[in-house]
Interface confidence: medium
């Protein structure tokens, strides 16, 4: 027999099938050109000394064989003696060590048996009603296919599934989606309605993450606020890596879990952008503001559960950095300016109302004035900080106000609003005899004392009504009592107390008259 033809003689070996588990399998035959055909198969077991024979029986009952030697693939033309228009039955017999192993038979019409391609190129993966949906472009000129998938997890072997018949320029498959483990999928196709035809090769792996990305287990720490008004956020613990199936352990696109850091700056709500999302690797510098930080884990199906932390504001206050002058037209704040063209955010909030939203104003980008100061002014009518109460003021600065991570704290301080000189006037001034020539003056704390750093000192004034002599006594802001000495008995005095801030003299309290009684000796 000629090697290019199917030989219509008995094969050169005994044809008893040994029935062993090894041997030829997965025979598939298909047309590879208008007149060319190919059969290929797998051989399970030791290959040394194995000879393969492709057997073919025609519908007439005549049978022939091709001897392929050790090759497990054979190409032949439609002039090799095998009818391509009529149904034929093909199988492989492998002869080794005086025994023959036989593959399962394939019955088909060769002219209709097209070698289908697996899904090629980009396989789109999405989630649909709790299932996995894969979609791909039908390979050219191969519309009309049956499709199968197989899938495995890191701990399971392959399981086979059916995608059903496909009949369009795009094909799709619904597959099971695992909640908490990654999966590897492969797809294969064969011509629709041709049970005898062969399956394509398996596609490249499609790596699919679990429906729920793993909860990110991370910890943060935040450094002290530096002199530049910024503090570094650092990651203490990296998130754990997802376990992957075997075919997804290289660079497998689609299965990755990405972790992102979502920063929400709670302070200064009037600025352009309050939230910024960053890759977890890029740990940012923060201002001294309060932040909420979330770590969001997401995969190709979208975001999963997140972990949120609150980073409190840095409460360190600058005692004298802010200067406030109150005039007839309104109020102006001055502070040491940052670089040219800096935008400032001035935020204030009544002390004790930290839960409520702070008021804030964004300045236009400004340059330092000749004294190197930045300013912010407002009119009396605006009502800003107009109530007579203590306000916490924080000023933030940024040369790039739309970039959340480029804000820094300029200063954090307290200010007493409204008519502070009147509101701060000490009340309940009382005078008690202390000795023959001294008295003790007490008063209730000024409202200014509720405002950290605002009350510079108390001043107690004593006037001798006879001589009109006046003496003033400075008192520490933490004290509400002073002893006046060297007083003369029988003389009328008036005493007043005022509370001063760094930039404002307070109003005197109502005059309190007293005298030390003359002691009459017996």
């Amino acid at each position: 027999c000629r090697t290019s033809e199917c030989c219509f003689q008995d094969p050169p070996y005994s044809d008893a099938d040994s029935g062993s588990a090894s041997g030829p399998r997965d025979l598939s035959c298909y047309r590879i050109s208008s007149a060319g055909y190919e059969c290929s198969w797998q051989y399970e077991g030791p290959t040394a000394g194995v000879s393969h024979f492709l057997r073919c029986c025609l519908s007439s009952g005549r049978c022939c064989y091709f001897a392929t030697g050790s090759a497990t693939r054979l190409q032949f033309s439609d002039q090799a003696g095998v009818s391509v228009l009529h149904t034929v039955t093909l199988w492989v017999e492998s002869w080794a060590r005086n025994r023959t192993e036989k593959s399962p038979e394939v019955t088909l019409q060769l002219y209709k048996s097209v070698k289908y391609k697996p899904p090629l190129g980009d396989i789109k993966v999405s989630k649909l009603a709790g299932q996995l949906r894969m979609e791909w472009e039908t390979p050219d000129n191969q519309v009309g296919a049956e499709v199968q998938f197989r899938h495995r997890t890191p701990s399971s072997s392959w399981k086979l599934g059916d995608c059903g018949p496909q009949d369009d320029d795009t094909e799709s498959c619904l597959c099971p989606l695992e909640m908490n483990v990654a999966q590897e999928f492969q797809l294969r196709r064969r011509r629709l309605g041709s049970q005898g035809s062969s399956w394509s090769k398996w596609s490249s792996p499609v790596c699919v993450p679990p429906e729920n990305p793993p909860q990110p287990q991370v910890r943060f720490s935040v450094e002290q606020l530096g002199r530049d008004g910024r503090r570094r956020l650092t990651l203490k613990e990296q998130p754990t890596q997802l376990e992957l199936p075997e075919g997804c352990q290289g660079p497998a696109p689609g299965v990755e879990v990405t972790y992102q850091l979502q920063l929400h700056m709670l302070s200064c709500p009037c600025k352009a952008k309050a939230t910024r999302t960053l890759p977890l690797e890029k740990m940012p510098y923060l201002s001294g503001a309060a932040y909420n930080v979330a770590v969001i884990s997401s995969n190709r199906f979208g975001p999963g559960p997140n972990q949120t932390w609150h980073i409190p504001a840095d409460t360190h206050t600058e005692p004298v950095a802010l200067n406030i002058s109150v005039g007839t037209n309104g109020t102006t704040m001055y502070w040491p300016a940052r670089a040219q063209s800096t935008t400032y955010c001035i935020e204030w909030q009544p002390v004790g109302q930290e839960g409520s939203l702070a008021t804030c104003n964004l300045t236009a980008p400004q340059d330092p004035d000749p004294a190197g100061m930045a300013t912010y002014s407002w009119s009396r009518e605006s009502g800003a900080m107009g109530q007579e109460k203590c306000y916490h003021i924080t000023i933030f600065a940024s040369a790039h106000p739309k970039k959340l991570t480029l804000w820094s704290t300029v200063l954090s301080t307290y200010h007493f609003g409204g008519n502070a000189s009147a509101a701060g006037t000490p009340h309940h001034v009382s005078v008690k005899n202390h000795s023959l020539d001294s008295v003790s003056v007490d008063w209730a704390p000024s409202l200014l004392s509720t405002c950290p750093g605002v009350l510079k000192e108390y001043v107690v004034r004593c006037r001798d009504e006879d001589s009109n002599q006046v003496s003033e006594h400075p008192v520490q802001p933490t004290e509400t009592q002073v002893t006046l000495s060297d007083l003369r008995a029988g003389v009328a005095y008036t005493v007043q107390v005022r509370a001063d801030t760094a930039w404002l003299r307070g109003a005197w309290s109502q005059p309190q008259r007293f005298s030390i009684k003359v002691q009459v000796s017996d």
Partner: antibody, heavy 119, light 107 residues
Framework: EVQLVESGGGLVQPGGSLRLSCAAS????????MSWVRQAPGKGLEWVAN????????YYVDSVKGRFTISRDNAKNSLYLQMNSLRAEDTAVYYC????????????WGQGTLVTVSS | DIQMTQSPSSLSASVGDRVTITCQAS??????LNWYQQKPGKAPKLLIY???NLETGVPSRFSGSGSGTDFTFTISSLQPEDIATYYC?????????FGPGTKVDIK
């Protein structure tokens, strides 16, 4: 450019014979199955016969079996249809067609030749 | 033999209309089905093979779909040059058989 040109048609009496030819050019003739397809006046298309590349396999529609013979000469790039015992119902335009993409898909056709069987 | 039927046998439509022709096989032929166009006095021309694959050089307004026994041929926007008779043809088994044709003309 693929070209198929039929010839040999004409008027013939019932019971008579005729030999149609199809000259092929622009492709490797010996690599393709070839077919004859006919079309009765005002009617649809009917596949008549086809032949394998080397002429070793030939298939016919039942209505012409035993009367018509398909053959080819690869050296001359020619396809033939020998028609014997012609009947009135064989009157048609006969087209030669290449089965190019695969068997049963006629991707190129000749312009046809008219066979009229009439007394 | 496998019988092929087509409907409608003829239709008139306006330029720009969507035209649909159906073809039915007497038994399951998978997607072994082709569509041809034949203009008056001319040889047929292959448009679609394997039920839905567009032959090279054929305008994309022509499309085909279906599998098994029911098939559809569509012209998405009828043009004057599309006046012709359209035939379906099966090649699942010998003898290869054609549908009776659908004649398409312009209103």
């Amino acid at each position: 450019e693929v070209q198929l040109v039929e010839s040999g048609g004409g008027l013939v009496q019932p019971g008579g014979s005729l030999r149609l030819s199809c000259a092929a050019s622009g492709f490797t003739f010996s690599s393709y199955w070839m077919s004859w397809v006919r079309q009765a006046p005002g009617k649809g298309l009917e596949w008549v016969a086809n032949i394998k590349q080397d002429g070793s396999e030939k298939y016919y529609v039942d209505s012409v079996k035993g009367r018509f013979t398909i053959s080819r000469d690869n050296a001359k790039n020619s396809l033939y249809l020998q028609m014997n015992s012609l009947r009135a119902e064989d009157t048609a335009v006969y087209y030669c067609a290449r089965e190019g993409l695969q068997l049963g898909i006629f991707d190129y056709w000749g312009q046809g030749t008219l066979v009229t069987v009439s007394s | 033999d496998i019988q092929m039927t087509q409907s409608p046998s003829s239709l008139s439509a306006s330029v720009g209309d969507r035209v649909t022709i159906t073809c039915q096989a007497s038994q399951d032929i998978s997607n072994y089905l082709n569509w041809y166009q034949q203009k008056p006095g001319k040889a047929p021309k292959l448009l679609i093979y394997d039920a839905s694959n567009l032959e090279t050089g054929v305008p994309s307004r022509f499309s085909g779909s279906g599998s098994g026994t029911d098939f559809t041929f569509t012209i998405s926007s009828l043009q004057p040059e599309d006046i012709a008779t359209y035939y379906c043809q099966q090649y699942d088994n010998l003898p290869f058989t054609f549908g009776p044709g659908t004649k398409v003309d312009i209103k």
